[in-house]
């Protein structure tokens, strides 16, 4: 049926076979029912993506414990709520532990590796480099535009965007959300950051044609490069101390 689609997630298959002929949408690759009035969890989106494939200074220094997603795409295991399972393994029985954004936080091991819990990522630092402009953006205007973006497009509660830093041409957006702060209907910072990342790359997960339209006082913001750092509530457990470069 033509009008049965999921506006917040392209990576779904929808039908009206549910009770009362209501439109229901399931994530590709997992068949989990998704709520199309809000963001889909990053785990289900990564799984769908893999299934589709088969088919003085103002800037923040990332903490020594911050980790970058260097491993890239993998086919994750999600729980029944669509969240990442603590232990992830590949087809060759290599396993590792992940945080709540699905990024590896331990060395890789074999199937005997134990991951006791999904450690929550409570701080995400999104670092953007913008294309050169005639003059630098006004920091206050940039701050309010990005806050507006995260609140409106990703429905992230304003309190979870803790700061916007700017030192031309680098912009840093800090998202902070402890488990205790996240209410039942609150969007997770992990999901907001992932949708934003895909939007910035021109790979929007939203169904409509309307893409990102970020402009500061009429001047478009064009992003050239993106780095995302993830800081967990507990330090990562790599065998050597490192801050990975992406």
């Amino acid at each position: 049926q033509s009008n049965c689609t999921c506006p917040t997630n392209k990576m779904t298959v929808c039908d009206t076979n549910g009770p009362g002929g209501v439109c229901q949408c399931r994530a590709m690759g997992s068949q989990v029912l998704v709520d199309c009035s809000t963001l889909t969890s990053k785990c289900l989106l990564l799984k769908a993506r893999m299934s589709a494939r088969k088919s003085g200074r103002s800037l923040v220094m990332p903490s020594e414990h911050a980790i970058l997603d260097n491993d890239g795409l993998y086919d994750p295991e999600c729980d029944d709520k669509g969240r990442f399972k603590a232990r992830q393994c590949n087809q060759t029985s290599v396993c590792w532990c992940v945080n709540s954004v699905g990024v590896r936080r331990t060395d890789k091991g074999d199937q005997s590796l134990r991951c006791d819990e999904v450690v929550r990522t409570h701080h995400i630092l999104i670092e953007l480099r913008h294309r050169p402009t005639d003059r630098a953006f006004n920091h206050s205007d940039l701050d309010s535009e990005l806050r507006r973006l995260f609140q409106e497009r990703y429905k992230l509660h304003p309190s979870f965007l803790s700061a916007v830093h700017y030192e031309e041409p680098t912009i840093q957006i800090e998202l902070r959300q402890n488990a205790s702060q996240k209410g039942l209907r609150d969007v997770d910072i992990a999901d907001a950051a992932y949708y934003f990342e895909r939007d910035i790359k021109g790979e929007s997960l939203f169904m409509g044609r309307r893409g990102l339209d970020v402009q500061v006082r009429g001047e478009p913001l064009h992003v050239e490069r993106t780095l995302i750092y993830y800081l967990d509530e507990k330090p990562p457990q790599f065998s050597m101390k490192r801050l990975t470069a992406g």
């Epitope: 033509s2 009008n3 506006p7 917040t8 169904m207 309307r210 339209d213």
Partner: antibody, heavy 126, light 107 residues
Amino acid sequence: AVTLDESGGGLQTPGGGLSLVCKASGFDFIDYDMFWVRQAPGKGLEWVGVINRSGSYTNYAPAVKGRATISRDNGQSTLRLQLNNLRAEDTGTYYCARGACTHCWDADSAGYIDAWGHGTEVIVSS
Amino acid sequence: ALALTQPSSVSANPGETVKITCSGGYSGYGWYQQKSPGSAPVTVIYWNDKRPSNIPSRFSGSLSGSTNTLIITGVQAEDEAVYFCGGYDSSPGYVGIFGAGTTLTVL
């Protein structure tokens, strides 16, 4: 105060074209999506189309798609609707409206309209 | 295309609480009051629950699932009008849509 002032209506001939203009004042025009909504005599409201802040994105109702063009001049704070190949069913009052949620994934929603113009009447008749 | 469903009419006595529902869209609902055909609509609620500063506090909106409700607490004679809900059609095209309108009669 937010003011939206439409003009350009009147008697039009079938097959012809019309150009409606909406002059905005009392707010930073560049910060808002803008809509056109119409109402046929004795009927309900009908969403016609939307344009985003920069003018880089437009979307139209199926009834006017291919015949309508919405444009804006942010310097002059004006919104325009060009509607070609006019039909009798295009008769009605045309309203210019402001959209309050420019970044929303569902920003084309008629539910984000927070201000309306007084309307301009269009009659398509031979 | 998707249709927003709202009752065609409701009636109430002055001082009563009126609830008008609108369903069938996603988030991003609004409510528009039109006192006479051809007169400019007035936004009473937009973006699910936001009320313009010039609208009395007796008007409120609430969203539950895919149903939005306009609530008028302590309805007054001057609230008699047609109320249109606006929303978002998720069918290909992803356009704005309006419900057919609800006529509120204050007895």
